[in-house]
């Protein structure tokens, strides 16, 4: 059967910046900001687009050592990311796969809402363990908050980059963030 679980969580980080860090660069960020949750992410095949296969390894002590994810959709315009967990742990035994959809929506206060859908495709009459749903949610929260903390501590990271001309700067050409751009023009 298919069991669908939907959750929403909020972040103080703007949608575009969060999508760039949490979704597009999670492979690099997760082991760095949450080593207790994820030890490494390895690209098995593909370039990040649909069809890409990633191996996510977990630290020593966790009962299951890795999962493999397949990227199904990356929508840069609407900040949407669909992927499926296709291997590891109970996948292949009680579960066929877990299909996940993440959509990051901007909020008026400058933050964002993450709308998350997890579809558990079970084999035969197997049901989804409540503990599985809880663990998935906790892992997602752990990663999100770790990335959020990193972004709050590194205000210049994962911001939109604008190329400012030499005339504007009165000197050499360089990349600066949108915040810097605003600051520059107000002067």
């Amino acid at each position: 059967g298919v069991f669908n679980y939907e959750t929403e969580t909020t972040s103080v980080i703007p949608a575009a910046r969060l999508f760039k860090a949490f979704i597009l660069d999670g492979d690099n960020l997760f082991p760095k900001v949450a080593p207790q949750a994820i030890s490494s992410v390895e690209n098995i095949e593909g370039n990040g687009g649909p069809g890409t296969i990633k191996k996510i390894s977990f630290p020593e002590g966790l009962p299951f050592k890795y999962v493999k994810d397949r990227v199904d959709e990356v929508d840069h315009t609407n900040f949407k990311y669909n992927y499926a967990v296709i291997e590891g742990g109970p996948i292949g035994d009680t579960l066929e796969k877990i299909s996940n959809e993440i959509k990051i929506v901007a909020t008026p206060d400058g933050g964002s809402i993450l709308k998350i859908s997890n579809k558990y495709h079970t084999k035969g009459d197997h049901e989804v363990k409540a503990e599985q749903v809880k663990a998935s949610k906790e892992m997602g929260e752990t990663l999100l908050r770790a990335v959020e903390s990193y972004l709050l501590a590194h205000s210049d990271a994962y911001n939109e980059q604008k190329l400012i001309s030499e005339e504007d700067l009165g000197g050499e050409q360089k990349l600066i963030s949108e915040e810097d751009l605003h600051h520059h023009h107000h002067h």
């Epitope: 977990f58 002590g61 009962p63 742990g89 109970p90 503990e131 663990a135």
Partner: antibody, heavy 123, light 108 residues
Framework: EVQLVESGGGLVQPGVSLRLSCVAS????????ITWIRQIPGKGLEWVSR????????YFADSVKGRFIISRDNSKNTVYMQMNSLRAEDSAVYYC????????????????WGQGTLVTVSS | DIQMTQSPSSLSASVGDRVTITCRAS??????LNWYQQKPGKAPKLLIY???SLQSGVPSRFSGSGSGTDFTLTISSLQPEDFATYYC??????????FGQGTRLEIK
Amino acid sequence: EVQLVESGGGLVQPGVSLRLSCVASGFTFSNYDITWIRQIPGKGLEWVSRISGSGGSTYFADSVKGRFIISRDNSKNTVYMQMNSLRAEDSAVYYCARRDSVLFSMNSWLDPWGQGTLVTVSS
Amino acid sequence: DIQMTQSPSSLSASVGDRVTITCRASQSISSYLNWYQQKPGKAPKLLIYAASSLQSGVPSRFSGSGSGTDFTLTISSLQPEDFATYYCQQSYSTPPITFGQGTRLEIK
């Protein structure tokens, strides 16, 4: 059906060796750690050893460290426990069990267990 | 190592009774606590995992609760097949996993 079957137990003299086997079926064997638990008849349960799904990590109770060796052959869905320098206090029923869990969790439990194999060390 | 202490060590009860077995950990183990049932000559069988989750196929008269250091296993209405020995086990600090000493449930 998920199943574990132990074999290899028997009556041996102190100081000798014995190899127990645990054959698994009904699940993706290499995804799961396998644990050995022992029980002196009429007494409680004592954890003995654990091996990771790949076989790369092994763990032992202090009481058997340096004497017992755990290994696995994932092509045969089998875990082995080589018990050397056996002592009278190693006499027990030995169970193998799958370390079960859910994805992304640190929590784990033992399910299922094999039927057990009796090891008696006596002169 | 984390010590697990069960109480009582044994108890007598009648069919239809409500029975509670407690398990205390020597330090906080969050919800990393499992319960097993063992009948004479048989292997232990998982009843409850993660303190309160009922294992598939286990009758709903069994329930688990607790968090931190204190946990309980409750059988709401004892059936003849429930007379057995029950063990708690922590998986918070592993290795080693540790078990309680067991609670033997006998017919009154």
